[in-house]
Interface confidence: low
């Protein structure tokens, strides 16, 4: 008669334990169009055999209270329901069921759920994915303003997300080593939504150069949760009828990690 070989079980099923560990504090942040790896670690009381386990990733959107399947893997097949979604089978062997999403879009923010099945056990964990976009900012003079000695300066921030942003104007004079926040003659326009869901905003500062000291440094300061620290762009009033003929562009380096990245 035939002997069927079964894998030796070293512990009983009652002693089996399956857990899923997600990102600390249950939140991950990424930048628009970046690749993100959403963490999910499988902790099992036995060595993992990936042919007898299943991983499914779901996403619940911020707007719709509905879950959609993003990726699944079961023993001998895997399927990405979102193009490019992937769980590394090589990493899965050592318990890393993290989901890689290339080119993340704003609408992909939401709650991600990692569900792991090692028969007969099932475990799951959730994490919030936050998608942010850092503003690109520039400072330029409105050439259309033609009143004598009057200049209108524009600080423009574009393609940022989420919507909340803070733009302030400051000045340093040679008389004072400290900056002064300017509140008069400042108008900050409405936030404009772009087709891709990001936002633009422009803040205007009106200056009468005859009343200002040459050498005064003006600064536009942009604060946004995607920025590691506030971004500032300076210009110096050199003489009456100061003109910024070329738009000053600032390449902004901002930290990863997203969040109120203070």
């Amino acid at each position: 008669h035939h002997h069927h070989h079964h894998e030796q079980k070293l512990i009983s099923e009652e002693d089996l334990d399956l857990k899923v560990e997600m990102m600390a504090r249950g939140i991950q942040a990424t930048r628009l169009n970046d690749s993100v790896t959403i963490s999910c670690k499988v902790i099992y009381s036995q060595p993992l055999n990936i042919t007898s386990m299943g991983i499914t990733w779901f996403r619940k959107s911020l707007t719709l209270d509905k879950e959609v399947k993003v990726f699944e893997f079961f023993g001998d097949h895997q399927k990405a329901f979102r193009p490019g979604a992937n769980v590394s089978l090589w990493r899965l062997k050592s318990g890393d069921a993290s989901l890689k999403l290339p080119g993340v879009q704003l609408e992909e923010a939401g709650e991600y759920r990692c569900e792991v099945v090692v028969t007969p056990l099932k475990a799951q964990g959730t994490v919030q994915l936050k998608v942010v976009a850092s503003p690109t900012s520039r400072l330029f003079q409105d050439q259309a303003v033609v009143k004598e000695n009057e200049g209108k300066y524009m600080c423009e921030s574009s393609r940022f997300y989420p919507k909340d942003i803070n733009i302030t104007w400051e000045k340093w004079t040679q008389k004072s080593p400290h900056h002064v926040v300017i509140s008069e003659n400042v108008i900050t326009g409405p936030t404009i939504k772009n087709m891709d869901g990001t936002f633009n905003i422009t803040s205007y500062l009106k200056l009468n150069s005859s009343q200002e000291d040459p050498g005064t440094v003006y600064r536009c300061v942009i604060r946004h949760e995607s920025l590691h620290t506030p971004v500032s762009i300076d210009f110096i009033l050199t003489a009456p009828q100061q003109s910024l003929s070329e738009p000053e562009k600032t390449d902004i380096f901002s930290s990863g990690g997203g969040g109120s990245a203070g």
């Epitope: 990102m23 600390a24 504090r25 939140i27 942040a29 790896t37 963490s39 803070n166 926040v181 604060r223 590691h228 620290t229 506030p230 380096f253 930290s255 990863g256 990690g257 997203g258 969040g259 109120s260 990245a261 203070g262």
Partner: antibody, heavy 117, light 107 residues
Framework: QVQLVQSGAEVKKPGASVKVSCKAS????????MNWMKQAPGQGLEWIGG????????DYNEKFKGKVTMTVDTSTSTVYMELSSLRSEDTAVYYC??????????WGQGTLVTVSS | DIQMTQSPSSLSASVGDRVTITCKAS??????VAWYQQKPGKAPKSLIY???NRYDGVPSRFSGSGSGTDFTLTISSLQPEDFATYFC?????????FGAGTKLEIK
């Protein structure tokens, strides 16, 4: 879970340099900034500076420029802070802190640097 | 630099007391304020971020409030393990700055 493990206490002579390390584990190393804080005996906390862990950027407190250099070895998930031209006022506990979504969410255990002749 | 002025510098209280520590910024820092707890010989522990949000695992008796220039940390009912030094910190602009600390002692 996230862990930041710093190197052990150091005793140095004035004028020497010291390199303190901070090894991170439990998270995607390069997605964060690591900052360093100084706490002199019986004193409050001072921010020294930070390094973006992909090695692309550093931010130093003006007060510590010329005194401190921060580097990162992504292969070992370790951040280093070197203090040069040590003086007695550099005697302090130095902490590395991971800058999470809302600043210093995880801290190393601290490294005591004593400068004494 | 933004100065963070913390008061009181020390405070004696009993288990069960309600305690409030204040922190005043020298200029508007929005809600970009964090609070830390430090026990002797230990690293600071993060309690509060964005002025009023508790980190995971921080007991609900700790609460933060305020915006602009005035901030408070409140411990609603002191427990024996709460006796420590507390620091506030602004992270709206560089250099990041801390309050000098409030030492909370047993009465």
């Amino acid at each position: 879970q996230v862990q930041l493990v710093q190197s052990g206490a150091e005793v140095k002579k004035p004028g020497a340099s010291v390199k303190v390390s901070c090894k991170a584990s439990g998270y995607t190393f390069t997605s964060y900034w690591m900052n360093w804080m100084k706490q002199a005996p019986g004193q409050g906390l001072e921010w020294i500076g930070g390094i973006y862990l992909s090695g692309e950027s550093t931010d130093y407190n003006e007060k510590f420029k010329g005194k401190v250099t921060m580097t990162v070895d992504t292969s070992t998930s370790t951040v280093y802070m070197e203090l040069s031209s040590l003086r007695s006022e550099d005697t302090a506990v130095y902490y590395c802190t991971r800058r999470g979504d809302y600043f210093g969410d995880f801290w190393g255990q601290g490294t005591l640097v004593t400068v004494s002749s | 630099d933004i100065q963070m002025t913390q008061s009181p510098s020390s405070l004696s209280a009993s288990v069960g007391d309600r305690v409030t520590i204040t922190c005043k910024a020298s200029q508007n820092v929005g809600k970009y304020v964090a609070w830390y707890q430090q026990k002797p010989g230990k690293a600071p522990k993060s309690l509060i971020y964005s002025a009023s949000n508790r980190y995971d695992g921080v007991p609900s008796r700790f609460s933060g409030s305020g915006s602009g220039t005035d901030f408070t940390l409140t411990i609603s009912s002191l427990q024996p393990e709460d006796f420590a030094t507390y620091f506030c910190q602004q992270y709206i602009s560089y250099p990041l700055t801390f309050g000098a600390g409030t030492k909370l002692e047993i009465k």
